[in-house]
């Protein structure tokens, strides 16, 4: 049987001879050279050689455990003469023994980290890690300990974990922002003779809001003309803040002073300046100087620093309003006036008023812009602003008159203002109702009494748009002698009815009926319209054959009825549209 132990070999051998590993030996070996030892497996014949007579194994090269810690080989013992094995092939191990030949290596050459300024002592910054290629299971060759070589007293490192923490209170970014820390990792548990490696950690303090804004001066003075429209910038103020980013953002506000309602302050997000702007129209004559208290404050405050004081500052802003010669100002932006359409000439409608807003209070004269009143329907008293009519009005012609009045400073005609006047003409019942169309109808000679031969409709130009209450009747001069009657339908229509049985076109070929139409408005208006009724010869179906001795041309299929309209079509000579007549025979 084979006789050997597991072999151990020290790495990194530096001797001049081959490094002896061990001896293979079979108890069948009598020392007479009859046995031959053969080696195969990892590195056999290359890294490891064997004396085939004695079984001695040697390493031919320097071995590195960190490259390969274990070699697995096979041993054979054969009869040199027959070549037959005298022992079964056997596997054995050569284990490479570690020496401390590797220094710790950090995962990064340079670490970058940030930590808020003013952080409490012991605040985590970053963790560094170094690894050692030596055998961690044997001795302390791979046991790494961390220490700080550079960066005290600001930072510390935990020896076992490599965690870097703040070590100094109140580190102020505004004082110093960048720190370079050098960390050492040493093996052998940090003992003498251990190997070491270092890394650099660049630490930046990030900003926290630990500084309030500060105005560089306590008072600012600006000027603006009184004519500045709302939104006009007057001036810029700027508070400085040692912080950066959002911690240096500043909001400006007007906290006090007489001009709180007259001015605004807005923040320019680009420059962090406060822009004072006009909020309402200024008036030099009312107030010449405004004193404001403007506050600059940080919108993003860290409560833990409030003990340092309020994160705001204030300054006084004095605004001087410069006088500007202003045009007259009307008492209203626009005037709406009403006048009845039956107003006499020189009727006063209303008045406008304007005055010079300047301290001088120059007198004002009024005029109508004739481009807006070409027909000179209205006039104005140049002294007192009274508007009056200079022509008669008619609502049915024009409901609204839109004119412009000008107020001009007498002493300075260049200074003038304009104001629109909207004059509504109120309706008066001054139009009589009229027939909606020209009515010409016919009656058959054989018509019976009380036949409806025409329906009348009326229209009226006056209000109301939504409807009128019209009444219809025969004119008094025709009422008693008429051959026809009017039936008021009470729905703003009326019917013409036959009053007798039969008409003779040879006796009377055409009747002219004067119909009086009135509204029930105030004052009542009426007109008389004439309806022409022709007497016609008709066939027994009620179709016209001739009227007033004139031949009639019928459009095919048209006939007429007792209750239907007959209309003369202007433009066609005596062509009537007809509907069927109901005969009473």
């Amino acid at each position: 049987s084979w006789m050997w132990n597991q072999f151990f070999l020290l790495e990194e051998y530096t001797g001049s001879d081959y490094q002896y590993v061990g001896k293979l030996h079979s108890d069948q070996d009598r020392g007479d050279g009859s046995l031959k030892y053969i080696l195969s497996g990892d590195g056999a014949g290359d890294l490891f050689i064997i004396n085939e007579n004695t079984g001695d194994i040697q390493a031919t090269k320097r071995l590195d455990r960190e490259e390969k810690p274990v070699y697995i080989l096979r041993a054979q013992a054969v009869n040199r003469r027959t070549g037959r094995p005298v022992e079964p092939e056997s596997e054995f191990i050569i284990k490479i023994h570690d020496i401390n030949d590797n220094e710790p290596i950090f995962t990064k050459d340079v670490y970058t980290a940030t930590v808020p300024e003013m952080a409490d002592v012991g605040t985590f910054v970053v963790q560094v890690t170094a690894t050692d290629a030596d055998d961690p299971t044997y001795g302390n060759s791979a046991k790494v300990v961390y220490s700080i070589l550079q960066g005290q007293p600001y930072f510390s490192v935990e020896s076992e974990t490599g965690i870097i923490k703040t070590a100094l209170l109140n580190m102020d970014r505004e004082n110093r922002e960048q720190y370079q820390v050098v960390i050492q990792a040493k093996d052998m548990g940090g003992q003498m003779g251990g190997l070491s490696g270092t890394t650099t950690v660049n630490i930046t303090l990030t900003d926290v809001n630990d500084n309030p804004p500060r105005f560089p001066q306590s008072t600012y003075q600006f000027k603006t003309p009184e004519s500045s429209p709302p939104g006009t910038p007057i001036g810029r103020i700027k508070a400085s803040d040692a912080d950066v980013g959002e911690n240096a953002e500043i909001e400006y506000s007007i906290t006090d002073g007489e001009g709180h309602e007259m001015f605004d302050v807005i923040t320019d997000q680009e420059t962090q300046e406060g822009i004072i702007t006009v909020k309402k129209l200024l008036d030099f004559e009312k107030k010449k100087v405004y004193t404001l208290k403007v506050e600059a404050s940080n919108p993003h405050v860290e409560p833990r620093f409030l003990y340092l004081g309020p994160f705001k500052d204030s300054a006084t802003v004095r605004i001087v309003v410069d006088d500007v010669d202003e045009p007259p100002v009307f008492s209203k932006l626009a005037y709406i006036l009403q006048i009845r359409e039956d107003a006499r000439i020189n009727t006063t409608i209303g008045s406008v008023a304007a005055q010079d807003p300047d301290a001088a209070r120059n007198p004002v004269k009024y005029s109508v812009d004739r481009h807006t009143d070409m027909d000179r329907i209205f006039n104005i008293d140049s002294g007192n602003g009274s508007i009056f009519t200079s022509k008669l009005l008619d609502r049915e012609t024009l409901l609204w008159h839109n004119i412009t009045v000008i107020a001009t400073e007498i002493n300075n005609p260049k200074q003038s203002s304009r104001v629109p006047l909207y004059i509504k003409v109120l309706d008066v019942n001054d139009n009589a109702p009229e027939f909606a169309e020209f009515y010409e109808t016919f009656v058959c000679e054989k018509a019976k009494a009380d036949q409806l031969i025409q329906t009348l409709r009326a229209v009226d130009k006056d209000d109301p748009y939504s409807g009128h209450q019209f009444s219809f009747s025969l004119a008094p001069e025709a009422a008693s002698s008429s051959n026809f009657t009017i039936q008021d339908n009470k729905d703003n229509t009326a019917g013409i009815l036959t009053r007798k049985n039969g008409y003779n076109r040879h006796e009377m070929s055409t009747y002219l009926l004067p119909v009086v139409i009135s509204d029930n408005d105030y004052p009542v208006q009426s007109s008389t319209g004439t309806v022409t009724v022709r007497v016609c010869a008709c066939d027994h179906h009620g179709n016209m054959q001739s009227c007033h001795a004139e031949a009639l041309i019928h459009p095919t299929g048209l006939s007429t009825g007792a209750g239907s309209e007959f209309r003369h079509d202007s433009g066609l000579n005596d062509i009537f549209e007809a509907q069927k007549i109901e005969w009473h025979e």
Partner: antibody, heavy 116, light 107 residues
Framework: QVQLLESGGGLVQPGGSLRLSCAAS????????MSWVRQAPGKGLEWVSV????????YYADSVKGRFTISRDNSKNTLYLQMNSLRAEDTAVYYC?????????WGQGTLVTVSS | DIQMTQSPSSLSASVGDRVTITCRAS??????LNWYQQKPGKAPKLLIY???TLQSGVPSRFSGSGSGTDFTLTISSLQPEDFATYYC?????????FGQGTKVEIK
């Protein structure tokens, strides 16, 4: 059906004021002129005032001009008569009536008594 | 103002009688005359407008005629419900004026 309903009458001292109302229904109120007519106890009818459909024009009998004001609210279908500086001779039943020339519908009337 | 004068101021008649009431204007009013009927404690009721046009719902026994200054209201056959006071009213010009009334009583 057309209905007119007056209210607001009562006893008032000479020089006092009253406001009469007339609520209209059953027709397009905004299309009609509306009138007030009064009747003193045991006497005939007297036209008082009229207002056109849009309210743009108003007219009064001489006996009430400057003291009475007629008005209307077309959105509420209501006619009004504001009576100021009332006199004993204003004592009457006041009717509101539809129309500006002929009065085709009348309310039931409201009695106004002016007496100290 | 235009004065309107009715005659008679009162009359007695029997059911079935033909009754005529006249109204005279102090100046021509064309056909702008209305007739109203009023019963005690009630509002007036329009009978005739524009001198001769019968208001809808009014019985055909009522008729009106005339123009200019003289007008007539005729009840062709008096019915029990026709006993009332009748007024004429002109609406030719402002102010609109009423007649003093004609009282029709049962004989």
């Amino acid at each position: 059906q057309v209905q007119l309903l007056e209210s607001g009458g009562g006893l008032v001292q000479p020089g006092g004021s009253l406001r009469l109302s007339c609520a209209a229904s059953g027709f397009t109120f905004s299309s009609y002129a509306m009138s007030w007519v009064r009747q003193a106890p045991g006497k005939g009818l007297e036209w008082v005032s009229v207002i056109r459909s849009s309210g743009s024009s108003t007219y009064y009998a001489d006996s009430v001009k400057g003291r009475f004001t007629i008005s209307r609210d077309n959105s509420k279908n209501t006619l009004y008569l504001q009576m100021n500086s009332l006199r004993a001779e204003d004592t009457a039943v006041y009717y509101c009536a539809r129309g500006g020339g002929y009065f085709d519908y009348w309310g039931q009337g409201t009695l106004v008594t002016v007496s100290s | 103002d235009i004065q309107m004068t009715q005659s008679p101021s009162s009359l007695s008649a029997s059911v079935g009688d033909r009754v005529t009431i006249t109204c005279r204007a102090s100046q021509s009013i064309s056909l702008w005359l209305n007739w109203y009927q009023q019963k005690p404690g009630k509002a007036p009721k329009l009978l005739i407008y524009a001198a001769s046009t019968l208001q809808s719902g009014v019985p055909s026994r009522f008729s009106g005629s005339g123009s200019g200054t003289d007008f007539t209201l005729t009840i062709s056959s008096l019915q029990p419900e026709d006993f009332a006071t009748y007024y004429c009213q002109q609406y030719y010009t402002s102010p609109y004026t009423f007649g003093q009334g004609t009282k029709v009583e049962i004989k």
